[in-house]
């Protein structure tokens, strides 16, 4: 049967159904692909532009391919199954009228069924499963997939990977509020904020009391200790941790294969022997780099270092002095530590906003 | 590795019929949608017709509706195309080429056969 | 229906040259475009698909582009054995050809 060799996958909405708001297209079908990564390994990452493994579109009629829709009701959309080029691609005819309630036709339920063919599912003959060939409406707020279904898209593609449990070792090091702690890098990972040192790491979750500690080689084996920089694109469950001229990806806590790959292959230039703290800023969708006196700024949605960088940091942070250990990005705001403090620094208006212990977020 | 090979070209009458083979090896044949296209002497090419893996789901080129049947065999992986009612202007070269799997044909065609030809004179 | 119009329908270029061939759908057809080469007395070969995707094995030199409406074949630096006809296609449709022919 045909599937994708592949766990990560993109898809790209092409153009969008007049139907609807644009947003609420892009939340159906956030929470379509969402029904098959619930149940599956599978991840996947919307790109605003360029080819992606799933193309989606709305076209009337004639289209591309040999399938030309029928105007309304008959065919309502089609898919094609895993491969390159047009194959995994989903196709919604612009003659139905597409809603997210129970009139005109549901773009939720569709959009499921139709990328079950995309990521490989063949129609059922089982009229509870979401890959029966029959439309009909159910309510997509209490929708859950068929047990059908489930065992079908496990075949491909096996369970979730579940996320490693986050132990306490048994040696924990010593106190949080001692004056001259400083950490090695800092950032968010989902709800929680995990402070690397060393060869262990605290986490904890934001306003509650509780601090737990796990070291590194226990969670991932494959990283190593003394982690210079980490930062979290939360939208796409990828935490980047970097050491030295290396970095890793860890996907849903779990590290990816084929890394450590070289800083390089992001951008930097040969000078560049470390990173010394990195952050994802999710508005921007940029990752800026601090490096010595330099920041870099990386553009993930392009997947490129923005031209024109390096850049003084001195220059473009005001009040930031080098140098940097680690950068956290937490409710709008970058937290930049230095040695045993931390500047609250507000990016919309480029100043520091306030001065704290870098061990404040422990209740120190 | 893929392979497509065509027969069954020869010169026929106007009016008369052909029925063109295709023998595929080299991948699973019953899973891939297959076409015939066609290439008139110092012509472009020219789409003839389509058929689902299945065979349950075909498509013809207007020149050719209603005169040429595709069908395909997939206990002997081979693909069929039978032309009746032939006219002067079907002389061309006739490929088999091979499209994508699953139950829709997108025309993407990544394999062709090396053609048979077809000449309708009387 | 769709039709595909590509120019130019021939073209004559020397070894070492960029060259361009472009075809124009008279409606969205998306990224659903290929280009395929044919040579004198062969089968055509499949040389790019989804408008800028490689096929495996072809040359780095050949490269598409476009959406929508409007796409580009680009061969960066002609080499001998590019001397040929190129068509770009989509789903039933073929555009006329461009012959590619040394000065």
């Known amino acids: 049967r045909s599937r994708w060799m592949k766990r990560y996958l993109t898809y790209r909405i092409y153009n969008y159904t007049p139907d609807m708001k644009r947003e609420d297209v892009d939340y159906i079908f956030q929470k379509a692909f969402q029904v098959w990564s619930d149940v599956t390994p599978l991840r996947f990452r919307k790109l605003h532009k360029d080819e992606a493994d799933i193309m989606i579109l709305f076209a009337f009629g004639a289209h591309g391919d040999f399938n030309y829709f029928d105007g309304k009701g008959g065919t309502l959309a089609h898919a094609f199954y895993p491969g390159p080029g047009i194959q995994g691609d989903a196709h919604f005819d612009e003659a139905e009228t597409w809603t997210k309630s129970f009139q005109g036709t549901n773009l939720f339920l569709v959009a499921v069924h139709e990328l079950g063919h995309s990521l490989g599912l063949q129609h059922s003959n089982n009229p509870k499963s979401i890959m029966y060939p029959t439309y009909r409406y159910l309510n997509p707020s209490t929708f859950r997939l068929s047990a059908d279904d489930i065992r079908n898209i496990q075949s491909l593609y096996g369970a979730p990977v579940k996320p490693p449990s986050l132990t306490k070792p048994s040696s924990p090091p010593s106190t949080f509020c001692h004056q001259s702690l400083s950490f090695d890098a800092v950032t968010t990972v989902g709800e929680k904020i995990f402070f690397f040192k060393d060869w262990f790491f605290w986490w904890k979750l934001p306003g509650s009391p509780a601090t737990n500690i796990t070291s590194i080689s226990s969670i991932w084996p494959s990283i190593p200790s003394g982690i210079q920089a980490a930062y979290e694109i939360e939208s796409r469950n990828q935490l980047f941790l970097f050491k030295d001229e290396k970095y890793w990806l860890i996907n849903n806590l779990v590290p990816e294969p084929h890394y450590p790959r070289s800083i390089y292959s992001l951008g930097f230039s040969a000078s560049v022997k470390k990173v010394d703290a990195a952050v994802f800023d999710p508005l921007r969708q940029k990752v800026y780099f601090f490096v010595d006196k330099h920041y870099w700024r990386y553009d993930v949605r392009q997947e490129l270092m923005d031209p024109a960088y390096p850049k003084l940091i001195s220059t473009h942070f005001p009040g930031i002095k080098p140098k940097i250990d680690a950068v956290l990005y937490f409710k709008r705001h970058y937290y930049i530590f230095q040695g045993a403090y931390q500047l609250e620094y507000d990016p919309l208006f480029r100043r520091v906003t306030k001065t704290l212990k870098s061990t404040s977020w422990f209740g120190c | 590795e893929v392979q497509l090979l065509e027969s069954g070209g020869g010169l026929v009458q106007p009016g008369g019929s052909l029925r063109l083979s295709c023998a595929a090896s080299?991948?699973?044949?019953?899973?891939?949608?297959m076409s015939w296209v066609r290439q008139a002497p110092g012509k472009g090419l020219e789409w003839v017709s389509r058929i689902s893996p299945s065979g349950g789901d075909t498509g013809y080129a207007d020149s050719v509706k209603g005169r040429f049947t595709i069908s395909r065999d997939n206990s002997k992986n081979t693909l069929y195309l039978q032309m009746n009612s032939l006219r002067a202007e079907d002389t061309a070269v006739y490929y088999c080429?091979?499209?994508?799997?699953?139950?829709?044909?997108?025309?993407?065609?990544?394999?062709w056969g090396r053609g048979t030809l077809v000449t309708v004179s009387s | 229906d769709i039709q595909m119009t590509q120019s130019p329908s021939s073209l004559s270029a020397s070894v070492g040259d960029r060259v361009t061939i472009t075809c124009r759908a008279n409606?969205?057809?998306?990224?659903?475009l290929n280009w395929y080469q044919q040579k004198p007395g062969k089968a055509p070969e499949l040389l790019i698909y989804a408008a800028s995707s490689l096929q495996s094995g072809v040359p780095s030199r050949f490269s598409g582009s476009g959406s929508g409406t409007d796409f580009t074949l680009t061969i960066s630096s002609l080499q001998p054995e590019d001397f040929a006809t190129y068509y770009c296609q989509q789903a039933g449709i073929f555009g006329q050809g461009t012959k590619l022919e040394i000065k």
């Open positions: 409606q969205s057809i998306y990224t659903y």
């Open positions: 080299g991948f699973t044949f019953s899973w891939y949608n």
């Open positions: 080429a091979k499209d994508i799997r699953g139950a829709y044909s997108s025309g993407l065609f990544d394999y």
